[in-house]
């Protein structure tokens, strides 16, 4: 019997009856065995078929068989009720081999031309199964040339049998106080050949309670106890189960904080499995009673291990543990049934004694020394010398523990010095310098630093002076010795101030005229304002109306007197403002260079002379009374004049302060 080609030779070819396309002879028997590679099958179809027709193809036939199974017995030219001819049919081997047998009997009634067939090996698609047959793979089947392989969904692993998907269902640990666990895929059928281990592990002190819920369906056996699939529950005390069948097991109170649940399945069956809802219990803690002015949250019927509650105080009350304030309070129930922290108190918020107000005082409104929530205090500034800046001074103790103003400010109000107060009555004579009396010029500042000069106090930590008076000290501000609060130049009873910084107007050029002869000294500490130390006011926009020609200004200082010595006592002189053109003209003749008097200057003095400021007065203020506010303001700064002070036809020249208000305000606000 001729053999077909053997793998690995190419598996395809042609078969034909002996003598084809001629008629075949009698008593012929021919057999072909075709073999394909593993995972392949053989496909065969006929291009010509002409055999003697006989009942059940008993005479002449072609028989196709694969292994022990006969695929077809063929004869005739066309199929009848009892005989089959191939027609256009394609035949497939069941495995990788196909046997073809041709036989003719001893006679033919007429000549028959036989058959011609073609074959080829083709891949078997193992993944396609006939309806009703078990699938090739549990989950995913992947066909390839010569074979197939199975794979599993996430959470499963391929069993050793290469077809079944076992669930990866071990190592799950449940640590919450309650929860649910179930067989894989529940309520769909659970997987085969799986071994699942679940752990419930709670903190010591808890006891786990298991409830089987919804449905229970685990493969069972009528005689033997759970031989196929089973569920077991293990604690450190005892084992429960095995469980199988269709009846929900009863509640299990484990009296243990750790439980291991084991579920094992075999290779067969189609059951939905189980679902467990677990809870836990523990020894309850005493019911928490909220302190007065506080409340407990959350409110529960009982509190067991790990349960917690917080205490929240009413507005205006704060948590206190003993004497210590707490930001928050939470207590946790312990395994022995006690709370881990003692109950705090809700104590009324105490803002504490209010801060002292510099140059002011505080008064308790609610009651003497009452500083608790909603208490009211009233700040006020020291009368006469200080006034409160944009604040009514009323503060309330708020829930956050801070004294808070009606505008919501937590910072102290500011007591600003009152400016321009003087004990001096106006209308003094303008003839002759006079001795100042206490409180007449409380803004007067004596500046020592190489030479004697003067200045005027602004606010409580600035001194306004002439640039030329402090130019040498601009880089060594601390060398300036600043004295105030005294009338006597040589008295030890002065208030000492020291300079932190000197600001000379950027437009001032030393030894090149006196334009922009203005400077500010910042003091390193605020001075205390009193009747002898009071700042001068800066001119208002409307101040020009009090500084017209012939209006009287007052200059004060310890400068040279007619006797040619520095004055021991503070002196002052009332002098009228001189017409600007008249003053300009007075200083246009030699030895004065043209343009000595600028628009940034004002002149004051008598045409007849005799009344003037002099060396040592430099930097001091030429002041005017604002009759609307009844406050004194600085209109000029003693700057320069004729070589001989008080000379007739010459005038004292002063820096015009109103031209420098923006400069002054900028420096003071920036520093």
């Amino acid at each position: 019997t001729p053999l077909g080609p053997k793998w690995p030779e190419p598996v395809f070819g042609r078969l034909a009856s002996p003598g084809f396309p001629g008629e075949y002879a009698n008593d012929q028997e021919r057999r072909w065995t075709l073999t394909a590679p593993p995972g392949y099958r053989l496909r065969l179809y006929f291009t010509h078929f002409d055999l003697e027709l006989s009942h059940l193809c008993e005479y002449d036939f072609v028989k196709l068989s694969s292994g022990a199974k006969v695929l077809a017995t063929l004869c005739g030219q066309e199929s009848t009720d009892t005989e089959r001819a191939p027609g256009k049919d394609t035949f497939y081997s069941l495995g990788s081999s196909l046997d073809i047998t041709f036989r003719s009997d001893y006679s033919n009634e007429k000549p028959f031309t036989g058959f011609e067939a073609f074959y080829a090996a083709e891949d078997i698609d193992e993944c396609q199964v006939a309806p009703g047959e078990a699938p090739t793979c549990d989950h995913h089947c992947h066909n390839h040339l010569g074979g197939f392989y199975c794979s599993c969904r996430a959470g499963y692993v391929l069993h050793r049998n290469k077809r079944t998907c076992s669930a990866l269902c071990s190592g799950q640990v449940f640590t919450q106080r309650s929860g649910e666990l179930s067989s894989p895929e529940y309520p769909r059928p659970y997987p085969k050949l799986s071994s699942c281990t679940y752990s419930i592990s709670l903190e010591e002190g808890f006891s786990v309670i298991l409830d089987f819920v919804e449905s229970f369906d685990v493969e069972t056996h009528p005689e033997t106890l759970c031989p196929y699939d089973f569920l077991k529950i293990q604690t450190d005390r005892e084992e429960h189960g095995p469980f199988c069948g269709k009846t929900l097991p009863h509640r299990i109170e484990t009296k243990s904080n750790t439980v291991t649940i084991t579920f094992v399945t075999d290779e067969s069956g189609d059951h939905t499995g189980w679902k467990i809802h677990y809870t836990s219990t523990a020894q309850p803690c005493p019911y928490p009673m909220a302190p007065p002015n506080g409340h407990v949250s959350p409110v529960q019927a009982k509190y067991i291990l790990k349960d917690s509650f917080s205490i929240f105080c009413e507005t205006g009350y704060e948590l206190l543990q003993g004497h210590l304030p707490l930001k928050s309070f939470t207590a946790v129930c312990q395994k022995d049934g006690s709370w881990d922290r003692p109950m705090p108190a809700c104590s009324i918020v105490d803002c504490g004694p209010p801060d002292d107000l510099p140059s002011g005082r505080v008064e308790y409104i609610t009651g003497p020394g009452v500083t608790t929530y909603k208490a009211v205090i009233q700040y006020s500034c020291e009368e006469t010398f200080y006034t409160m800046k944009v604040n009514d001074g009323k503060y309330v103790c708020e829930a956050d523990g801070f004294w808070t103003s009606s505008k919501g400010e937590k910072s102290l109000p500011v007591c600003e010095p009152v400016c321009g107060l003087s004990a001096r009555t106006t209308g003094g004579r303008i003839y002759g310098g006079q001795k100042a009396k206490p409180g007449d010029f409380p803004w007067q500042v004596l500046i020592l630093g190489g030479t004697t000069a003067a200045g005027a106090l602004l606010y409580d930590n600035w001194v306004l002076t002439a640039a030329h008076a402090v130019y040498e000290q601009k880089h060594d501000a601390s060398a300036l010795d600043i004295r105030m609060g005294t009338l006597k130049r040589l008295s030890p009873h002065y208030t000492q101030a020291w300079s932190e910084a000197v600001f000379i107007h950027e437009g001032y050029t030393h030894d090149a005229g006196f334009d922009n002869d203005i400077a500010l000294i910042k003091l390193n500490n605020k001075v205390v304002i009193n009747s002898n130390i009071t700042p001068i006011c800066l001119p208002r926009k409307e101040a020009e109306s009090f500084m017209r020609t012939d209006d009287i200004g007052t200059a004060s200082g310890w400068g040279l007197t007619q006797r040619g010595f520095l004055a021991r006592n503070l002196m002052y002189v009332d002098i009228p403002i001189v017409d600007h053109q008249k003053c300009t003209a007075a200083y246009e003749k030699p030895p004065y260079p043209r343009g000595s008097v600028t628009a940034n200057m004002l002149c004051a003095g008598l045409e007849s002379g005799g009344k003037d400021s002099c060396r040592g007065d430099s930097g001091g203020a030429l002041v005017f009374l604002d009759s609307e506010t009844e406050r004194w303001f600085v209109g000029g700064i003693v700057s320069w004049g004729s070589m001989n002070c008080g000379e007739a036809g010459q005038y004292g020249v002063y820096t015009k302060v109103i031209n420098y208000i923006p400069w002054i305000e900028n420096i003071i606000s920036d520093f």
Partner: antibody, heavy 121, light 106 residues
Framework: QVQLQQPGAELVRPGSSVRLSCKAS????????MHWLKQRPIQGLEWIGD????????HYIEKFKDKATLTIDKSSSTAYMHLSSLTSEDSAIYYC??????????????WGTGTTVTVSS | QIVLTQSPVIMSASPGEKVTMTCSAS?????MYWYQQKPGSSPRLLIY???NLASGVPVRFSGSGSGTSNSLTISRMEAEDAATYYC?????????FGAGTKLELK
């Protein structure tokens, strides 16, 4: 040269008063403040107060306000300190000292010879 | 008021030896003044404005310091320097003195 002359000692009865003198020479008396100080072995040096001889302006520390009174006699260039209601606590050496006028004005460039006051019955 | 604490309370030095004594203030002072007082005599100004030597004072005396810490130094001790030394301030009212440092000759 500049000198401040004080009597050497004064013995006084408790409850009485005493006037201590300090005669200045060698400088213009009215140009310098005059200060008075008390020295006892345990308490050390204490400042009492001062006076401006040009116009008799005075200053006292709180402790001595009711105890001491400072005065001036310009014609003799003499400064005086009157101590009243004397007790044993007032027994001490009392110095007059001239205040500096060159720098801070707050120290003593010349000291008197000192008067030892003993209060005893 | 500002309290001035002098240290040491008592010290001794040999002729030619360098001597330093300190004066510590309870608050910052701008200037310190030093006086020398010998037994039976009145105090005498040594140093003014922290570091300036008073008229007639030997150059072996010097003063230094700032804020709350000041010192008086004698570069080479001489027999005539045996005395009690006082520091004084008037940066803050009232004027106060230290309790003194007694310097003895070894």
């Amino acid at each position: 040269q500049v000198q401040l002359q004080q009597p050497g000692a004064e013995l006084v009865r408790p409850g009485s008063s005493v006037r201590l003198s300090c005669k200045a020479s060698g400088y213009t008396f009215t140009n310098y403040w005059m200060h008075w100080l008390k020295q006892r072995p345990i308490q050390g040096l204490e400042w009492i107060g001062d006076i401006d001889p040009s116009d008799s302006e005075t200053h006292y520390i709180e402790k001595f306000k009711d105890k001491a009174t400072l005065t001036i006699d310009k014609s003799s260039s003499t400064a005086y300190m009157h101590l009243s209601s004397l007790t044993s606590e007032d027994s001490a050496i009392y110095y007059c000292a001239r205040g500096d006028i060159t720098t801070t004005l707050r120290y003593f460039d010349v000291w008197g010879t000192g008067t030892t006051v003993t209060v005893s019955s | 008021q500002i309290v001035l604490t002098q240290s040491p309370v008592i010290m001794s030095a040999s002729p030619g030896e360098k001597v330093t004594m300190t004066c510590s203030a309870s608050s910052s002072v701008r200037y310190m003044y030093w006086y020398q007082q010998k037994p039976g005599s009145s105090p005498r100004l040594l140093i003014y404005d922290t570091s300036n030597l008073a008229s007639g004072v030997p150059v072996r005396f010097s003063g230094s310091g700032s804020g709350t810490s000041n010192s008086l130094t004698i570069s080479r001790m001489e027999a005539e320097d045996a005395a009690t030394y006082y520091c004084q301030q008037w940066s803050s009212y009232p004027l106060t003195f230290g309790a003194g440092t007694k310097l003895e000759l070894k």
